[in-house]
């Protein structure tokens, strides 16, 4: 067990803070909840503290919760491939470019680390080149989320990892909006981290609303499990 992994044996409180600017529309989001890495489970609630969110909530899911991949459930035989937990408590910087097909892009930078007993994800997001009447600024996405695999490779030069994946957002007219994600994670501290073999995170997310919440918000339940590396059985004759 890595030193960081010991921090995730129980339920851990999570705080998410995002400052965003998309085509000049500035906004802030605060989120709170908890993660349980034993089950790869995240429960989070987010509010836009600046009024109405200028972009659809589903376009921010990867920035919020795929941002705290330290809560992914790594099976016993894959624990030595868990970069995310090994970087804790000092944490990691996560940078992404998210390119929406035939539309604009988000660039995000986040610091994910422990502050006391809380895992904090502080994010800056900048979005440019979006069409004012497109699927994103035109709010044409359905309020739901598909299952995805996040493919992870080691980045030995930067002592971190890279990840690539495509998100499929459902559009109200029945079509799909693709969002290409290019992700890079580097440790904040200078302690040893685990650099993984190639594998993937299998992610399932459910979006809902709190009927009593008056502010623009999103409730998120997510399960994430690492896979893609076979278990080696040693046979003794």
């Amino acid at each position: 067990m890595s030193k960081g992994e010991e921090l995730f044996t129980g339920v851990v409180p999570i705080l998410v803070e995002l400052d965003g600017d998309v085509n000049g529309h500035k906004f802030s989001v605060s989120g709170e909840g908890e993660g349980d890495a034993t089950y790869g489970k995240l429960t989070l609630k987010f509010i836009c503290t600046t009024g109405k969110l200028p972009v659809p909530w589903p376009t921010l899911v990867t920035t919020f919760s795929y941002g705290v991949q330290c809560f992914s459930r790594y099976p016993d035989h894959m624990k030595r491939h868990d970069f995310f937990k090994s970087a804790m408590p000092e944490g990691y910087v996560q940078e992404r470019t998210i390119s929406f097909k035939d539309d604009g892009n988000y660039k995000t930078r986040a610091e994910v680390k422990f502050e006391g007993d809380t895992l904090v994800n502080r994010i800056e997001l900048k979005g440019i080149d979006f069409k004012e009447d497109g699927n994103i600024l035109g709010h044409k996405l359905e309020y739901n989320y598909n299952s995805h695999n996040v493919y992870i490779t080691a980045d030995k030069q930067k002592n971190g990892i890279k990840a690539n994946f495509k998100i499929r957002h459902n559009i109200e007219d029945g079509s799909v909006q693709l969002a290409d994600h290019y992700q890079q994670n580097t440790p904040i501290g200078d302690g040893p981290v685990l650099l993984p073999d190639n594998h993937y995170l299998s992610t399932q997310s459910a979006l809902s609303k709190d009927p009593n919440e008056k502010r623009d918000h999103m409730v998120l339940l997510e399960f994430v499990t690492a896979a893609g590396i076979l278990e080696h059985h040693h046979h003794h004759h």
């Epitope: 705080l15 503290t49 919440e213 008056k214």
Partner: nanobody
Amino acid sequence: DVQLVESGGGLVQAGGSLRLSCAASGPTGAMAWFRQAPGKEREFVGGISGSETDTYYVDSVKGRFTVDRDNVKNTVYLQMNSLKPEDTAVYYCAARRRITLFTSRTDYDFWGRGTQVTV
């Protein structure tokens, strides 16, 4: 557990002002005021985050009511101006363990017993 005690309620004429106080027995996160009129559900009125960077008010009180807090005294206040008969209710103070300001009742961990405001 944290105890919350409200004070400052009373009878006031329409157009008048009242300042409600809520003293907490220890540190809290976000704090809010809810109200409940006879025969109606308890509703969020206004609140302030634990970091004091975020406040929020329902439309019916915006511009008339103000929430502020004193973290040294572990006290939150509700300044009510230009009071209307429809503001008549029992006003409850509520607190969360954590800092984010939500408006849903179910997000609050601690509640006071309420103070009556009659306009």
